[in-house]
Interface confidence: low
Amino acid sequence: KESCDVQLYIKRQSEHSILAGDPFELECPVKYCANRPHVTWCKLNGTTCVKLEDRQTSWKEEKNISFFILHFEPVLPNDNGSYRCSANFQSNLIESHSTTLYVTDVKSASERPSKDEMASRPWLLYR
């Protein structure tokens, strides 16, 4: 029998390489049985995750899964970083794994660093 606990399906180590200036939708896949949980997005800052309260979000409902979407309109260079969605369900807080946005500034897209470079030399992200 399928569990009726809320499930957040962001996979460990998931990542997106995106360009500054483009629109982007960051999806948090959510499964629930009856009442849709309250879901929020936060951005990791060191050991804390700062809640994104003033950002545009929306729900996209599908037949077997729903998506809580964080909208970037457009993506900005400082949107680079790791994000997590969280759901409040029956007084429990359920947290997703983090997903990382690698933002390349359009101005330097022609000299875009490789993922290996970005991992080992993160300052390249802010050129």
Partner: antibody, heavy 120, light 108 residues
Framework: QVQLQESGPGLVKPSETLSLTCTVS????????WSWIRQPPGKGLEWIGY???????NYNPSLKSRVTISVDTSKNQFSLKLSSVTAADTAVYYC??????????????WGQGTLVTVSS | EIVMTQSPATLSLSPGERATLSCRAS???????LSWYQQRPGQAPRLLIY???TRATGIPARFSGSGSGTDFTLTISSLQPEDFAVYYC?????????FGGGTKVEIK
């Protein structure tokens, strides 16, 4: 009953781009994640990447620099492109549907697979 | 990435015997994220077990899964002729999703 069918050339020259399409019938491509998985002759399975119908993708880091997965919802198809192929890319390529159980991700429907040989 | 190692590589058994297949992960994997597949010659893999122990739709009760942490087991209680095939474990605890190298169950 959901069915998946891979199509594309069975022979690709070294350094060229391998292109395959998976056609989904018996169900909509919407609301699910879809994957490509390959199997070199006589060897095990290797996950290539997945795509959601909205276009969200994730790729295996070992192939990421050469892989593009795209989706065409109007045709109920998703596609794989693998660039700069070598003999090591010779394999049976499978497309598969990702099912989101409450416990995690598995592949519940598979295509029959198509053998792609890289040779000049 | 998480490396999945299956043993033995080949298991030679007779119909009616019990088969025990092992899958070991290079790091701890939550039991929620471990699946098993069967692949018969010339066919695509078929999902048998997900979440370590839950049988997929239409899978006979003679197939069972167990384990936790880094060690997982697929058991076939009484081998039927159609069970002689290659079996793969797969983890989705971390990306990239990875499969074991497979265990071939052959007729003795």
């Amino acid at each position: 009953q959901v069915q998946l069918q891979e199509s594309g050339p069975g022979l690709v020259k070294p350094s060229e781009t391998l292109s395959l399409t998976c056609t989904v019938s018996g169900g909509s491509i919407s609301s699910y994640y879809w994957s490509w998985i390959r199997q070199p002759p006589g060897k095990g399975l290797e996950w290539i990447g997945y795509i959601y119908y909205s276009g969200t993708t994730n790729y295996n880091p070992s192939l990421k620099s050469r892989v593009t997965i795209s989706v065409d919802t109007s045709k109920n198809q998703f596609s794989l492109k693998l660039s700069s192929v070598t003999a090591a890319d010779t394999a049976v390529y499978y497309c598969a549907r990702v099912v989101l159980y409450s416990t995690g991700w598995s592949f519940d429907y598979w295509g029959q697979g198509t053998l792609v040989t890289v040779s000049s | 990435e998480i490396v999945m190692t299956q043993s033995p590589a080949t298991l030679s058994l007779s119909p009616g015997e019990r088969a025990t297949l092992s899958c070991r992960a290079s790091q701890s994997v939550s039991s929620s994220y471990l699946s098993w597949y069967q692949q018969r010659p010339g066919q695509a893999p078929r999902l048998l077990i997900y979440g370590t122990s839950t049988r997929a739709t239409g899978i006979p009760a003679r197939f069972s899964g167990s384990g936790s942490g880094t060690d997982f087991t697929l058991t076939i209680s009484s081998l039927q002729p159609e069970d002689f095939a290659v079996y793969y474990c797969q983890q989705d605890y971390n990306l990239p999703l990875t499969f074991g190298g497979g265990t071939k169950v052959e007729i003795k």
